[in-house]
Interface confidence: low
């Protein structure tokens, strides 16, 4: 791979733990601003896989709060508006970092952790066994 | 709010940029152990509103790779395998947080982000404006 | 840090009226669309009005209209939901949302305020 040179304005690494400790700063840069703000505020519950979203709340971690989607039916609804079970709503997972404070209720020392959430739901075809 | 009592053994927080700036382990710690490998590997290419990845390389980012979802068509597809455009693919968006090297190549320091990524795609219906 | 605080909740009678409000700061208020957003016991979240930058659109979700009415003050960055001839059904905790984002960090919303609605 590339080897990018080391900025000599990097703070001092003679933390013993070093390179598994890192200093972050928490004052958040968001990237998001250019994006389309009526981006997905409705498709929860227009999709065809509709689903609720649920509030999980840890104030160990960091972000505090996070929003779990669970789809509303095990099928999906039909042009008609009913729910057609040959079809299949499933959640669409993705893994995300988040920041655990580690000793735990410490204000300034966290730990790096991957949590799996659901962010909303998609219609797919089932697979269907065969029986021979 | 609730006061959680400050744990005796928490790092120093002498810093002047404190609490802005804290130490993180980057030791992650993965709570996802139980969950299916299998999950959502395939629902990409089973859904109605089925998508692509695409590889996202960042290497002055943590994570360097993020994988984005990219609908593959405007519409849906239908129970004969066909794309109907009255329904909408869309991508299901969620903000992440990832960690930025900041200076600039700095393997120990880093500042918060959050990005946004498209997750997965959903199939909706189109919200259609009737003109008078 | 963008905070979201919300008050006015309570216990009221069907038929009753509450107003509830939010004090927003640590961003350009007046640059977004707000929401008020209700959790139910037990249930999802539920949009329940939204209304734009300058006030100009408002929207409300169908078991809503006609009683509430969703409002903003761009100078005081304040937000508000009068609710008039309250339900029981219309009991939840009542969130004020920044901007049309996917809801997941903690930064878009505040800690809620409960509505109860009993007699």
């Known amino acids: 791979g590339i080897t990018i040179p080391r900025n000599p304005g990097c703070p001092n690494s003679e933390d013993k733990n070093f390179p598994r400790t890192v200093m972050v700063n928490l004052n958040i840069h968001n990237r998001n601003t250019n994006t389309n703000p009526k981006r997905s505020s409705d498709y929860y519950n227009r999709s065809t896989s509709p689903w609720n979203l649920h509030r999980n709340e840890d104030p160990e971690r960091y972000p505090s709060v996070i929003w779990e989607a669970k789809c509303r039916h095990l099928g999906c609804i039909n042009a008609d508006g009913n729910v057609d079970y040959h079809m299949n709503s499933v959640p669409i997972q993705q893994e995300i970092l988040v920041l655990r404070r580690e000793p735990p209720h410490c204000p300034n020392s966290f730990r790096l952790e991957k949590i799996l959430v659901s962010v909303g739901c998609t219609c797919v075809t089932p697979i269907v066994h065969h029986v021979a | 709010g609730i006061t959680i009592p400050r744990n005796p053994g928490c790092p120093n927080s002498e810093d002047k940029n404190f609490p802005r700036t804290v130490m993180v382990n980057l030791n992650i710690h993965n709570r996802n152990t139980n969950t299916n490998p299998k999950r959502s590997s395939d629902y990409y290419n089973r859904s109605t509103s089925p998508w692509n990845l695409h590889r996202n390389e960042d290497p002055e980012r943590y994570p360097s790779v993020i994988w984005e979802a990219k609908c593959r068509h405007l519409g849906c597809i239908n129970a004969d395998g066909n794309v109907d455009y009255h329904m909408n693919s869309v991508p299901i968006q969620q903000e992440i947080l990832v960690l930025r090297r900041e200076p600039p190549h700095c393997p120990n320091s880093f500042r918060l982000e959050k990005i946004l990524v498209s997750v997965g795609c959903t199939c909706v219906t189109p919200i259609v404006h009737h003109v008078a | 840090q963008v905070q979201l605080v919300e008050s006015g909740g309570g216990l009221v009678q069907p038929g009753g009226s509450l107003r509830l409000s939010c004090a927003a700061s640590?961003?350009?208020?007046?640059?977004?669309?707000m929401y008020w957003v209700r959790q139910a016991p037990g249930k999802g979240l539920e949009w329940v009005a939204k209304?734009?930058?300058?006030?100009?659109?408002?929207y409300y979700v169908d078991s809503v209209k006609g009683r509430f009415t969703i409002s903003r003050d761009n100078a005081k960055n304040s937000l508000f939901l009068q609710m008039n001839s309250l339900r029981a059904e219309d009991t939840a905790v009542y969130y004020c949302?920044?901007?049309?984002?996917?809801?997941?960090?903690?930064?878009?919303w505040g800690q809620g305020t409960l509505v109860t609605v009993s007699s």
């Open positions: 949302a920044k901007g049309e984002i996917l809801p997941l960090y903690f930064d878009y």
């Open positions: 640590g961003f350009t208020f007046s640059s977004y669309g």
């Open positions: 209304i734009e930058q300058d006030g100009s659109e408002k």
